[in-house]
Amino acid sequence: DLKVEMMAGGTQITPLNDNVTIFCNIFYSQPLNITSMGITWFWKSLTFDKEVKVFEFFGDHQEAFRPGAIVSPWRLKSGDASLRLPGIQLEEAGEYRCEVVVTPLKAQGTVQLEVVASPASRLLLDQVGMKENEDKYMCESSGFYPEAINITWEKQTQKFPHPIEISEDVITGPTIKNMDGTFNVTSCLKLNSSQEDPGTVYQCVVRHASLHTPLRSNFTLTAARHSLSETEKTDNFS
């Protein structure tokens, strides 16, 4: 009996540019002789329904149809036909199929590969065109994929040390697509510093599929109102 097992759950998630290993384990009733077996990996993109051959291994020959694609002959001996793809790109997401032939038997398995990119986050202070005692804080998230992202603002005061979500005076702009397929977005918080307690800590909280824990950037309101020179107006605040 010949059986193939892919990643549990049927989906593998990998970071952009990573050297990903797409799992495929072979279960066979006898020891594997790699000189008399065949492995073929196929890929079907998310946008087109056409299946493309990525890699093939037959006895004494292997061929990569995608540069750098490889199945380890040394791992194959112990039943591991996993495919290594170095420098994975966003457009390589989709369905991967591992087909194993031990003549006359054939087995296959499929897995969905999701490629994600983590956002980079930075805080900026923008005072251009703002009224006296008014500040605009911008939280820029860039280089993320997929597009879905959640940006919230929180504050902690000495009176209320637990974070409180801010819902007023928050504007989150549209997501912008970059040339490389990743996305950027900016969320703005308008503050009237005269109405806020000095020592209050504000946080921009970014949640995204690529992040295990939210990305947090913070600043503390000081007694003296921020007065930044022109060149500092788009500097990193935190």
Partner: antibody, heavy 120, light 111 residues
Amino acid sequence: EVQLVQSGAEVKKPGASVKVSCKASGYTFTDYNMDWVRQAPGKGLEWIGDINPNNGGTLYNQKFRGRVTLTVDKSISTAYMELSRLRSDDTAVYYCARSEVFYGNYADYWGQGTTVTVSS
Amino acid sequence: DIVLTQTPLSLSVTPGQPASISCKASQSVDYDGDSYMNWYLQKPGQPPQLLIYAASTLHSGIPDRFSGSGSGTDFTLKISRVEAEDVGVYYCQQSKEDPRTFGQGTKLEIK
């Protein structure tokens, strides 16, 4: 920095078993196999076998089959080599070594070695 | 099993002079256009360290005075100018077939 840190020296009686550990750090544990090699006093190197941490698959030198068991604990990036029914000629330094398996096959980082002495 | 025979078994070299070690395999260690022959150096009291893999590729951090060549059954490790720190035992190893086997070792000492 890639590091393989092995457990300390062992003294065993003939017929007993020994279990040597190899704690890996500084790389993705499942991306490489773990080889085990031994060296008897004043002798050359002898390959015992290897294990694929990805699926726990093992390959053994026939000479040791039935006496050696290679295992891994992925959660703590540690590989183990257990040798049973020890004989005096099993006295050796036992090494674990990280083994590249995709772009060639070679042991690029080695543990410091564990001395196993079998004596009655 | 593939048997690897190294020659010479020992050599004594003056610093600055070249050195060469041969490794002959009982059968070809080539597969799909690549040669699965590696070279290691074991310095006294230390574990082995990788010098050369795939017959001729220098491992990162290894000085370029070391070089490897050969294919099929005949392989050579060369040191262009021997230095005092090169003393130890040199082993060839094939990784084409299991069990992976080592040569018996060549001991290099400084004159």
